[in-house]
């Protein structure tokens, strides 16, 4: 044990993908512990990750209660219990996070092409509707359930034998595109929320090509 001063947390950063939301901060604690509190603008502060030596806190359970609310978190620093610090009464040190509105700011996770099916000169490409940790009536909602028509997918597709890409867009999770008969095509999709100003696009999905397992071909 010893005498030491606590230091305030800094670099508070929200890391959020498909509403899985973690607050990270620095520094690694030396002779101190942290407690995180989270609140909406009009709500009460709620303690999470209480008395922890971690430098991250999973706040998903709180933000999924209402993803359209704006949240603020704060990280308190306390001297560890083995620290013989004797100062006068004083509020604990804390640092506020940036405000965070999950609906507007959570990153869109990398989408996955669930399947594609060719019928003649048409191909139907289906994007997996990823489950989120947002609940309604005790069931987890999908990304589409949460975002509705705010979410679109962009399909990039090209002949396996060439590099020229075409694009298609949908506000569902399915594309129906025209292809040349007898040609193999490759596909990649990207999730997009056009109305956003930040974090508008996901990374591209893994590429899937015709003639591989996910596809089906019918005359």
């Amino acid at each position: 044990s010893g005498t030491t001063n606590t230091v305030a947390a800094y670099n508070l950063t929200w890391k959020s993908t498909n509403f899985k939301t973690i607050l990270e901060w620095e520094p690694k604690p030396v002779n101190q512990v942290y407690t995180v509190q989270i609140s909406t603008k009009s709500g009460d502060w709620k303690s999470k990750c209480f008395y922890t030596t971690d430098t991250e806190c999973d706040l998903t359970d709180e933000i999924v209660k209402d993803v359209k609310q704006t949240y603020l978190a704060r990280v308190f620093s306390y001297p560890a219990g083995n620290v013989e610090s004797t100062g006068s009464a004083g509020e604990p040190l804390y640092e506020n996070s940036p405000e965070f509105t999950p609906y507007l700011e959570t990153n869109l996770g990398q989408p996955t092409i669930q399947s594609f099916e060719q019928v003649g000169t048409k191909v139907n490409v289906t994007v997996e509707d990823e489950r989120t940790l947002v609940r309604r009536n005790n069931t987890f909602l999908s990304l589409r359930d949460v975002f509705g028509k705010d979410l679109i997918y962009t399909l990039y597709y090209w002949k396996s034998s060439s590099s020229g890409k075409k694009t298609a867009k949908t506000n569902t999770n399915e594309f129906l595109i025209d292809v040349d008969k007898g040609e193999n095509y490759c596909f990649s999709v990207q999730a997009v929320i056009p109305s956003r100003t930040v974090n508008r696009k996901s990374t591209d999905s893994p590429v899937e090509c015709m003639g591989q397992e996910k596809g089906e071909f019918r005359e």
Epitope: T35, Y78, P79, G81, E84, A89, G90
Partner: nanobody
Framework: QVQLVESGGGLVQPGGSLSLSCTAS????????MGWHRRSPGKERELVAV???????HYADFVKGRFVISRDNAKNAVYLKMNFLTPEDTAVYYC????????WGQGTQVTVSS
């Protein structure tokens, strides 16, 4: 300096219960952590339990559901209900409040013996 005054210690038989209380001499903000530590003979002081202003708790592993910490923000008080006491729980129990600094009470002796 925040003064913390404990009460409720004493002699109890193994398997018995005791309730400790601690009151602060001045208003303790709800952002403070309050709790209890103990020092057994020949050992370092160790955390027993702590509680946040909104009632979130953290217990040492050795507590194993035997102790319950609670807090009354209006009374600037923290409590520790100790059940199923064993001789290993014999120690001086210190009230603790942490804000910018740690504050400690003088301690109250708990002796578990038949």
């Amino acid at each position: 300096q925040v003064q913390l005054v404990e009460s409720g210690g004493g002699l109890v038989q193994p398997g018995g219960s005791l309730s400790l209380s601690c009151t602060a001499s001045e208003t303790i903000s709800s952002t403070y952590i309050m709790g209890w530590h103990r020092r057994s003979p020949g050992k370092e002081r160790e955390l027993v339990a702590v509680i946040s202003g909104d009632g979130v708790t953290h217990y040492a592993d050795f507590v194993k559901g035997r102790f319950v910490i609670s807090r009354d923000n209006a009374k600037n008080a923290v409590y520790l209900k100790m059940n199923f006491l064993t001789p290993e729980d014999t120690a001086v129990y210190y009230c603790y409040a942490a804000g910018r600094w740690n504050h400690w009470g003088q301690g109250t002796q708990v002796t578990v013996s038949s």
